[in-house]
Amino acid sequence: TLNSVLNSNAIKNLPPPLGGAAGHPGSAVSAAPGILYPGGNKYQTIDNYQPYPCAEDEECGTDEYCASPTRGGDAGVQICLACRKRRKRCMRHAMCCPGNYCKNGICVSSDQNHFRGEIEETITESFGNDHSTLDGYSRRTTLSSKMYHTKGQEGSVCLRSSDCASGLCCARHFWSKICKPVLKEGQVCTKHRRKGSHGLEIFQRCYCGEGLSCRIQKDHHQASNSSRLHTCQRH
């Protein structure tokens, strides 16, 4: 597995010697066009850690989830926040640290013996109970290998895109997540405006395939903001 390779004592493929400093903090890096990082001292910490702006949990580290930093705050600013430990309050699975999941608003341990039953129960849960159902598992690798022995075909229930066969991604469908086709050139795609609206999509689309990006359709440039159609287009 990924973790066993990373944690093994195998000598990694090291680069040729670098000609200077290891990091380049001075390099300007953009998260996405037109997105500004939260500035000032508001999110700065003593070690100059700058939070990472995000639109979904999958973009964050394995021990993080994506949310607004202030409770009930500006939905337009979402950053990667540290996951919540056992017995802490939660609203969805992704908020809980690896090895835990969200049950009745509290992070609880993913006991291996009943975990699969919980997953199946979660898939059939009503929308009002847990808005994101399987979101958290898209990035929790702890137990997923026990559940998926073969790559899922189109329509198979999944936890993350790596559970799906080539050419498919794991996307929300009603209140579970299933393998759907990666979008081809000309197909309609979803361009998130990073306002948190992705969390409400119950029919989530896959991303655009290799060499394609989600852009406004040429003849829709003049249309009003709300009716702009995005399609997968060549870079």
Partner: nanobody
Framework: EVQLVESGGGLVQAGDSLTLSCTAS????????MGWFRQAPGKEREFVAA????????HYADYVKGRFAISRDNAKNTVLLQMSSLKPEDTAVYYC??????????????????????WGQGTQVTVSS
């Protein structure tokens, strides 16, 4: 054995385009960020572009923004760097690298050389004026 192999380098004229390719073998890299760095003679290795594990996020250094585009195909374990409007100052050895998804991520994660565990041997790009 894990290997990253770059290809596509060469000698081009200023203003031309070039596409570099990086093929990974020995493991799957779908939970890794893939990046391109470059090193000109007598200079430090510098960040060029990166694409995250989630495929939806790309990152570019200011000096290549709008000219270079990074993409990846997890099924084929390949990463592409499409370079256009090349300048003489883009001349360097270009390295492909892979950084594991961290527990915590910060703005500078993708541009920090030391976060990358696996590196290719590099491909030379020379842009003549």
């Amino acid at each position: 054995e894990v290997q990253l192999v770059e290809s596509g380098g060469g000698l081009v004229q200023a203003g031309d385009s070039l596409t570099l390719s990086c093929t990974a073998s020995g493991r799957t890299f779908d939970n890794y960020a893939m990046g391109w760095f470059r090193q000109a003679p007598g200079k430090e290795r510098e960040f060029v572009a990166a694409i995250s594990w989630s495929l939806s996020r790309t990152h570019y250094a200011d000096y290549v923004k709008g000219r270079f585009a990074i993409s990846r195909d997890n099924a084929k374990n390949t990463v592409l760097l499409q370079m256009s409007s090349l300048k003489p100052e883009d001349t360097a050895v270009y390295y492909c690298a892979a950084a594991p998804r961290p527990k915590r991520i910060s703005v500078s994660y993708f541009s920090t050389t030391s976060n990358y565990d696996y590196w290719g041997q590099g491909t030379q790009v020379t842009v003549s004026s």
